[in-house]
């Protein structure tokens, strides 16, 4: 039985040109995390494998930095980065847990006055 739950940073906003940390936290399970996939809609951003470390998709290599921990840092944000992001935790023996984050990238002045849930 899958007992775990995923907490995420939820809905977040950041300003164009800035950076943001995407984080998910798996709790309430003793299952071993074997791999975490980060995806944007249906596009793979990065994989963090317990035995092989990080793999960043070539198309994102210049704008994505792994960490902290199993999180992912997006840099040089553009308005095209607005959208849904998913953390997919592969665990043993539980199976797969998925968390969702919605990121809105705003023009600088808008983000300054209207940003909620922003990670510094």
């Amino acid at each position: 039985m899958m007992t775990g739950t995923i907490e995420t940073t939820g809905n977040i906003s950041a300003e164009k040109g800035g950076s943001i940390i995407l984080q998910c936290h798996l709790s309430s399970t003793t299952a071993q995390v074997t791999q975490v996939n980060w995806e944007q809609q249906d596009q793979l951003l990065a994989i963090c494998n317990a035995d092989l470390g990080w793999h960043i998709s070539p198309s994102f290599k210049d704008r994505v930095a792994p960490g902290p921990g199993l999180g992912l840092t997006l840099q040089s944000l553009t308005v095209n980065d607005t959208g849904e992001y998913f953390c997919i935790y592969h665990t043993y023996p539980d199976g797969t847990y998925t968390g969702r984050i919605f990121l809105e990238v705003l023009e600088s002045s808008v983000a300054e006055h209207g940003a909620r849930f922003q990670i510094p």
Epitope: I21, H25, L26, L52, W54, G67, P68
Partner: antibody, heavy 117, light 107 residues
Framework: EVQLQQSGTVLARPGASVKMSCKTS????????MHWVKQRPGQGLEWIGA????????RYNQKFKGKAKLTAVTSANTAYMELSSLTNEDSAVYYC??????????WGQGTSVTVSS | DIVLTQSPATLSVTPGDSVSLSCRAS??????LHWYQQNSHESPRLLIK???QSISGIPSRFSGSGSGTDFTLSINSVETEDFGLYFC?????????FGGGTRLEIN
């Protein structure tokens, strides 16, 4: 077997700079953060910073900005840390350690630095 | 920066005893907490990752628990090779930080 081999003991004068190395083997160097940790005699562990050789991203403890500079040469599977403007406070053992998102799972044997006039 | 406070600073025990070491974070770090052991004149060694996940090659007498701000490393029936220093470390946010350590010594 994963190995992190650090350079040998260093004796340096106050005001000088030292550059130590951490040569890795048997894993994909560009897939893991390389962390550097300071330990003064009889003391705890202090995180200095980390570099991700995959794209040269670096993160620093604010306390060590301007003191430590982290670099990595992927062709040699080797990470480096340079310490500048040395003082007695910099006398310590410095460890390199890799992290692939699941804790600092492998550590070097440490490089001992002694600053003395 | 996140501050990790370990207690007690020193713990004197007899081989065969079971012990608990505490690590408290200054703010919630979810389960992003790892435990290390350091024996005299050796490099640290990863014992537990993400608060409770076991590490290959580490004896099963070591276990971890906790979430949020309060974490515990338990050693069930201490053996002589377990004496040394124990550190917790968080990977919730940059900069990573370590606790001040707990020294486990023979009573």
């Amino acid at each position: 077997e994963v190995q992190l081999q650090q350079s040998g003991t260093v004796l340096a004068r106050p005001g000088a700079s030292v550059k130590m190395s951490c040569k890795t083997s048997d894993y994909s160097f560009t897939s893991y953060w390389m962390h550097w940790v300071k330990q003064r005699p009889g003391q705890g562990l202090e995180w200095i910073g980390a570099i991700y050789p995959g794209n040269s991203a670096a993160r620093y403890n604010q306390k060590f900005k301007g003191k430590a500079k982290l670099t990595a040469v992927t062709s040699a599977n080797t990470a480096y840390m340079e310490l500048s403007s040395l003082t007695n406070e910099d006398s310590a053992v410095y460890y390199c350690s890799r992290e692939g998102g699941y804790g600092l799972d492998y550590w070097g044997q440490g490089t001992s630095v002694t600053v003395s006039s | 920066d996140i501050v990790l406070t370990q207690s007690p600073a020193t713990l004197s025990v007899t081989p065969g005893d079971s012990v608990s070491l505490s690590c408290r974070a200054s703010q919630s770090i979810y389960n992003n907490l790892h435990w290390y052991q350091q024996n005299s004149h050796e490099s640290p060694r990863l014992l537990i990752k993400y608060a409770s996940q076991s590490i290959s090659g580490i004896p099963s007498r070591f276990s971890g628990s906790g979430s949020g701000t309060d974490f515990t490393l338990s050693i069930n029936s201490v053996e002589t090779e377990d004496f040394g220093l124990y550190f917790c470390q968080q990977s919730n946010s940059w900069p990573y930080t370590f606790g001040g350590g707990t020294r486990l010594e023979i009573n």
